[in-house]
Structures are given as structure tokens and as C-alpha cells.
């Protein structure tokens, strides 16, 4: 008799999930020699232990603590780039500006980037059919709790000037419900962080508006100021030129506004 299985509204665990996590861990330690003390088998075991045999709507940050401990990593606290709804450009930027880091440039972020996973209560099986959707099912699901945990820790570690890349093409340039708006903003430490500098990325070729005056940016400024952190904002009118100028700062066309 086929066993009844809970049907969730979200996509199931990414295929080859265990193999992918393990392979990513090994790759990461290969290209980041300072992390070669990490035992990737233990990392996978801790990752698995956070959600296997647990109800996928009942996951806590505590479940991920063994993994957090194994993945402890020191990144320069003054070189942190946060992002919201513009992941690809943020990653292209840190790929060129090698001394800056997004969460996905750290081991734990790299391991889980773009993956989905969940288990089932009281069975050691991984659910490849469906996983809980944050809105339709529950917020305390394995994926959401993971990102909340690592994002909080990442923001807590930041110091001096913290940069955030925001998508100027969206109706809410700053969204209070995003991971940045709901987790990272509230976990920057005022005693360590002097300034949050927002980079608003323009989408249209001819878009010359000052998106730093957008109401949602003003809302972000208000939240940050109330936390005793200074706020500054820059328009990035031409993201393609911006990246090119990061690559080749001495280019004569890079002195003008980008």
C-alpha cells in the first residue's frame, strides 16, 4: 500500500541534492585554501541533520547550529555586500571586486545557493516531490529558516561601511518583507556599522530619475537612522558600465557618473 505523503505547494528537493551539497563543499575548499580544514562529510551530515526526520514546517534556527558551527568563516567585516532582488549583478560584482563578499561567496551560502530541500516527519527520506512554500504553507520551513539563520549571522558580522545592492526596476526598491528588509537590516550592529550605503541599480537605458528619492528608499533610510547607523545612497544608472569600470577603473570613460 503506497504510504500517504504530505503534498506541499512548493517545488520538491532539488535533484541530486546530497551529491550537489557535497560536491560544492569540496569545490569550495579546493578554491578557498583557507577553508581546507573543513570536513565536507561532517558538513553534509550536519546539513542533513538539520531537516531529516523533522516536520518541514517545524524547523528552528537551533536545528542549523551544528552546521553553522562547522561553516564558521571569517570574512573581512568591512567588505560585505548585501543585495535584494538583484543577486546576479551582486555576484558579478564580487567576481570582479575580489575583496568584497556576498553571503553566497561564503561556504554556507555557496552550498545552498538556488537549492531547495525538505524532509518528512519521522522518516529519513528526503522529499523530492514537494516542499513547503513560505507563503502558502509555512515560514518555518528548512530553506527559509536556513537563509534567515545565515543572513542574520552575516549581517551581525558586518562593520564599518556596509553596501547593499537594490533593484531599481521593482515596484518596491526596498521591500520590508525581503530577507534584506526583514532580517539583515535589523541585525546590523550599530556599535560596529557606521554607514549603510545603498546602490540602486537602474534597469532602463534612458532612466535618469534619482531613485534614491523613492519612498521605499526613504523608508529604509528612516529604519537605518533610527538604529543609529548613517545612510547613503547612490544611483547606478548603467550597471554594464559600472561593472566594466570596476574591472578597468583607469578607463577614461569611468570618471563620469555611472
Amino acid at each position: 500500500v503506497p504510504r500517504w505523503r504530505q503534498q506541499w505547494s512548493g517545488p520538491g528537493t532539488t535533484k541530486r541534492f546530497p551529491e550537489t551539497v557535497l560536491a560544492r563543499c569540496v569545490k569550495y575548499t579546493e578554491i578557498h585554501p583557507e577553508m581546507r580544514h573543513v570536513d565536507c562529510q561532517s558538513v553534509w551530515d550536519a546539513f542533513k541533520g538539520a531537516f531529516i526526520s523533522k516536520h518541514p514546517c517545524n524547523i528552528t534556527e537551533e536545528d542549523y547550529q551544528p552546521l553553522m558551527k562547522l561553516g564558521t568563516q571569517t570574512v573581512p567585516c568591512n567588505k560585505i555586500l548585501l543585495w535584494s532582488r538583484i543577486k546576479d549583478l551582486a555576484h558579478q560584482f564580487t567576481q570582479v571586486q575580489r575583496d568584497m563578499f556576498t553571503l553566497e561567496d561564503t561556504l554556507l551560502g555557496y552550498l545552498a545557493d538556488d537549492l531547495t530541500w525538505c524532509g518528512e516527519f519521522n522518516t529519513s527520506k528526503i522529499n523530492y516531490q514537494s516542499c513547503p512554500d513560505w507563503r502558502k504553507d509555512c515560514s518555518n520551513n528548512p530553506v527559509s529558516v536556513f537563509w534567515k539563520t545565515v543572513s542574520r549571522r552575516f549581517a551581525e558580522a558586518a562593520c564599518d561601511v556596509v553596501h547593499v545592492m537594490l533593484n531599481g526596476s521593482r515596484s518596491k526598491i526596498f521591500d520590508k518583507n525581503s530577507t534584506f528588509g526583514s532580517v539583515e537590516v535589523h541585525n546590523l550592529q550599530p556599535e560596529k556599522v557606521q554607514t549603510l550605503e545603498a546602490w540602486v541599480i537602474h534597469g532602463g537605458r534612458e532612466d535618469s530619475r534619482d531613485l534614491c528619492q523613492d519612498p521605499t528608499i526613504k523608508e529604509l533610510e528612516s529604519i537605518i537612522s533610527k538604529r543609529n547607523i548613517q545612510f547613503s545612497c547612490k544611483n547606478i544608472y548603467r550597471p554594464d558600465k559600472f561593472l566594466q569600470c570596476v574591472k578597468n577603473p583607469e578607463d577614461s570613460s569611468c570618471t563620469s557618473e555611472i
Epitope: 563543499c25 569540496v26 579546493e30 578554491i31 585554501p33 565536507c40 567576481q95
Partner: antibody, heavy 123, light 112 residues
Framework: QMQLVQSGAEVKKTGSSVKVSCKAS????????MHWVRQAPGQALEWMGW????????DYAQKFQDRVTITRDRSMSTAYMELSSLRSEDTAMYYC????????????????WGQGTLVTVSS | DIVMTQTPLSLSVTPGQPASISCQSS???????????LNWYLQKPGQPPQLLIY???TRAAGVPDRFSGSGSGTDFTLKISRVEAEDVGVYYC?????????FGQGTKLEIK
Amino acid sequence: QMQLVQSGAEVKKTGSSVKVSCKASGYTFTDYIMHWVRQAPGQALEWMGWIDPEYGSTDYAQKFQDRVTITRDRSMSTAYMELSSLRSEDTAMYYCARVAIITTVASGGFAYWGQGTLVTVSS
Amino acid sequence: DIVMTQTPLSLSVTPGQPASISCQSSESLLHSNGKTYLNWYLQKPGQPPQLLIYWMSTRAAGVPDRFSGSGSGTDFTLKISRVEAEDVGVYYCQQFLEYPPTFGQGTKLEIK
């Protein structure tokens, strides 16, 4: 079985570019970093850079930073190394290579190599 | 960059006799994980290099046990207990402790 098969020999003019391919088979292409190493005639081996085939992220040796571009086509399980502004000193055998995994640890040695692609640069 | 220096640059050995190649690194290759990131390769004429030894002393799959690697943080040795005709070629040491990985200039082994 695991194989890295490279494109054929090339003869190029000074100042032009060359693009060498490396087709992987017998393993999951995105699971391993791909490295490129070159060897000029009678010279030692020289590491050029790596690509993570899953994300497309790269890192290059300082010496080649301005002239080399490593890319990949995931659907073809193929990595590419393009070298621009060729000079006579770039005449060399170009290899793609990857490590072996020893019980979930990268060995740190290039255990698998392509057969090599000879690039000759002439004026 | 870490500089790798090999000695001798060439070596002529009678079959059945032992051979020894030295390699020195400009910095210690011992990682905090306890592994020493020093590799040895043999490149036979017209072929790509083949990995012989990794982590200073671990033989790669399929490598005969007449090959052995030893050393400390900066001084390393590849020993062949009894040289065979098929061992001819150029031997390279390589560090993979940090990027860029760097190779020694090579030691050419010939049969007398």
C-alpha cells in the same frame, strides 16, 4: 570512464586570439573545478586559471589576468580557454585538468588531464 | 607566489637502481588541517603529466609502490626504489597550498 578531450592544434598570428575547448565526459561536469595549465616547448608547467562550471565563476593567474577568459557551456559539458593578444611566447601546449576527490576531500593534485592542444603563434 | 626549486635538473640511472629527486618550496606547504600540499607528477614524452603523489606522500591511484614521497614543510623528496625503463620522463613537483599553484622547473630522468 572519466575523460577530458581537447580541441585540435591551432596556428595563430601574433596579435590574434585563440579559443581552446575541453569536453568532459564520464562524470558530472558541474561537480568539479576545471583548471587550465600551459607548457611552452621545453619549459615547466604554468597554471593559468580555473572555472567553477556550475556558477561560471573564475580566477586567473596574475600574469594572464588581462588576456585570458575561461568560460563554459554546461549543456555541452565543455570548458573553454580564450587567450587574446597572442605573442610568440604564447606558443605552448595548453591543458585542461581537474582534481580527484578522495573520500570527500579534494586531493590538491591534478589527477585528470586533457590530451593537450598545441597553439603555435607565428608572425 | 610560492617558488618551487628542483634538484637535480637531470638524472641518469641504471635500471634497477634507486633514484631520488629533491624539491624545495619558498614557504611551508603544511596546512592547518595537517596535510602538506605538495604533489609530484611524471610527464612522459608526448603525454600530459600524470599525478604520482599528492599530499606529499600519498600515492595516486594506480601508481606503483616503488614511488614514494617524503619531506617536511619546505623540503621534499621523491624516491624511486628501483628505476624501470618506463619511468623515463620529466618529474615535476607542485605546490597547491595556495593560489596560484606553482610547479618546479622539472627533473629529466634518463636510463643509462
